[in-house]
Amino acid sequence: SGRGEAETRECIYYNANWELERTNQSGLERCEGEQDKRLHCYASWRNSSGTIELVKKGCWLDDFNCYDRQECVATEENPQVYFCCCEGNFCNERFTHLPEAGGPEVTYEPPPTAPTLLT
């Protein structure tokens, strides 16, 4: 595989389940992986009746579906869990749902936060 052109070193981090998992709720995550593996950022969320519930954001290890994607775009039509991934530092800050079958594009803007670095 090898590292991608838009090398990912840091991603926006968020964990809705932070208390149970004993992690920070939000911040920045430094991505780590073997030299021959590509690194990505991801975002995952749920959409219940139009209400967006952010679930996770962070680093994601070598995945063909994320290669050369500069923006975080989920393409599945109506999944239980929405998921997008991308390459490039902090590319998961904003995320979009654009179903392959067509339909309205919805972009989610992050609220302003004071980032904390997670390693």
């Epitope: 998992e21 996770k56 290669y67 998921f83």
Partner: antibody
Framework: QLQLQESGPGLVKPSETLSLTCTVS??????????WGWIRQPPGKGLEWIGS???????YYNPSLKSRVTISVDTSKNQFSLKLSSVTAADTAVYYC?????????????WGQGTTVTVSS | DIQMTQSPSSVSASVGDRVTITCRAS??????LAWYQQKPGKAPKLLIY???NLQSGVPSRFSGSGSGTDFTLTISSLQPEDFATYYC?????????FGGGTKVEIK
């Protein structure tokens, strides 16, 4: 309804190459929504992921087998294949092919029935 | 590699019992875990993905929970067809790895 069927020799001699093919019916192997994988299960033991391939030919292998494994896809035949070289008795197992979701976390939702491969002289 | 440890390795239960199987990852895997059921001589069957999402066609008596390193598969009321071996599988890391399995036997 999507079905997967493994085929190949049930007996392979030590040091030779194990070759298996998985034929996909009821759906296209060229779909960008899925990956295709091989998993094995030694007698009385658990599951071991061998590797996965996407329609584009991008492959991922288990590092413990990487030097011996090749997975390839033939979209014209709607098949994907496994080659495992320099086999030993430790490679005796039931070999399964499976369809995996687009992302690894989707899991493997359709499996072949498995084929038993014995490595013995 | 991320090691997945299941407990117990086997459990004896009766029809109607509530059965709980646990899976622990050697490092945090967020919610990216799947559960499979395997009957003797058959291929595994996907039950749950992303820790708690029921795969289409799987009975609602199966449920999954947990995140981080500790996960649980629960069968709320064991049915005769549920006697099988159950495996967990982590997804975020490569290589993909499975737990050693938990065999649910008839008491």
């Amino acid at each position: 309804q999507l079905q997967l069927q493994e085929s190949g020799p049930g007996l392979v001699k030590p040091s030779e190459t194990l070759s298996l093919t998985c034929t996909v019916s009821g759906g296209s192997i060229s779909s960008s929504s899925y990956a295709w994988g091989w998993i094995r299960q030694p007698p009385g033991k658990g599951l071991e992921w061998i590797g996965s391939i996407y329609y584009s030919g991008s492959t991922y292998y288990n590092p413990s087998l990487k030097s011996r494994v090749t997975i390839s896809v033939d979209t014209s035949k709607n098949q994907f294949s496994l080659k495992l070289s320099s086999v030993t008795a430790a490679d005796t197992a039931v070999y399964y092919c499976a369809r995996a979701g687009k992302y690894r976390w989707h899991g493997m939702d359709v499996w072949g029935q498995g084929t038993t491969v014995t490595v013995s002289s | 590699d991320i090691q997945m440890t299941q407990s117990p390795s086997s459990v004896s239960a009766s029809v109607g019992d509530r059965v709980t199987i646990t899976c622990r990852a050697s490092q945090g895997i967020s919610s990216w875990l799947a559960w499979y059921q395997q009957k003797p001589g058959k291929a595994p069957k996907l039950l749950i993905y992303a820790a708690s999402n029921l795969q289409s066609g799987v009975p609602s008596r199966f449920s999954g929970s947990g995140s981080g390193t500790d996960f649980t598969l629960t069968i709320s009321s064991l049915q005769p067809e549920d006697f099988a071996t159950y495996y967990c599988q982590q997804a975020p890391d490569l290589p993909i790895t499975f737990g050693g399995g938990t065999k649910v036997e008839i008491k």
